[in-house]
């Protein structure tokens, strides 16, 4: 799905509704772990105002948190601004409002700099039908399969979802 | 090894527009990501945008809007359009070959620079 890195045809409010994340991939594998920073779950998403609301589940001291996200946007069309442990640069990878999402973010945090990719679909019972585009991307973005993390249905915020 | 060579380089005046080009030659470059960085007189080389092989990309904030990085495999070309330019853009700008997104990373190859100059 070369070139398809924007926002998708009918704007941002096709991104609206529910969400479910299937895999995470990282340069640095403690942001994913299990209680790393990034260890989060896409519950919903919203748009306005050409801003991305998000909320999503992170879970803390045994229990998931929902917490809501904005992502601004900026003069780039596929790029948002998120605050969120520190400082991220949003893109949107490929996009396919009906079916999945992938993004990645460019993390700053103090002086330190890595890269997150998030792959999340609509249907979980597809997740696998969208898995190897989400491999391709992490390849070329420079993010290896062993950097991949598949999240599973006995995942602590699966639970949480509804 | 990948050769680089960067050109479009040139003296603009404040609010104008250059196009950057930078030709890879030797090795394929096109399953690589391709850089813009760009080094100020006693400043450190700093970030500037950067596409992959399948033209994702990654700006850093202050030329975001205002620059567009982009690609063609058949060329083996990478460039990077300049717009709304202003006098802090004035560097030298070299294009590299890198493993992916991340500023800095893993770069294999630098090109030798093209000055800008952004001046009333």
């Known amino acids: 799905q070369e070139g398809n890195h924007e926002e998708p045809q009918g704007g941002l409010e096709e991104l609206s509704g529910r969400w479910h994340s299937v895999a995470l991939a990282s340069n640095k594998s403690d942001l994913i772990k299990p209680w790393g920073h990034f260890r989060v779950f896409i519950h919903s998403m919203s748009a306005k105002d050409g801003n991305l609301h998000g909320d999503i589940l992170i879970p803390q001291d045994g229990q998931c948190e929902k917490v809501s996200l904005t992502a601004f946007k900026t003069a780039t069309s596929n790029k948002f601004d998120l605050e969120y442990w520190g400082h991220n640069d949003l893109y949107l990878a490929e996009v396919d409002p009906k079916s999945y999402l992938i993004l990645y973010m460019i993390n700053q945090y103090n002086d330190d700099t890595s890269l997150v990719a998030h792959l999340m679909v609509r249907d979980l019972s597809r997740q696998q039908d969208f898995l190897p585009a989400f491999e391709s991307v992490c390849e070329d973005i420079g993010l290896h399969k062993d950097q991949i993390v598949v999240l599973s249905d006995d995942d602590r915020c699966q639970g949480s979802r509804d | 090894a990948v050769q680089l060579v960067e050109s479009g380089g040139g003296l603009v005046q404040p609010g104008g527009s250059l196009r950057l080009s930078c030709v890879a030659s030797g090795s394929s470059s096109r399953n690589y990501a391709m850089g813009w960085y760009r080094q100020a007189p006693g400043n450190e080389r700093e970030f500037v945008a950067v596409?992959?092989?399948?033209?994702?990309?990654h700006y850093a904030n202050s030329v975001s809007g205002r620059f567009t990085i982009s690609r063609d495999h058949a060329k083996d070309t990478a460039y990077l359009q300049m717009n709304s330019l202003k006098p802090e853009d004035t560097a030298v700008y070299y294009c590299?070959?890198?493993?992916?997104?991340?500023?800095?990373?893993?770069?294999?190859?630098w090109g030798t620079g093209t000055q800008v100059t952004v001046s009333s």
């Open positions: 590299n070959t890198q493993a992916g997104l991340l500023p800095f990373m893993t770069v294999y190859d």
């Open positions: 596409i992959t092989s399948r033209g994702y990309t």
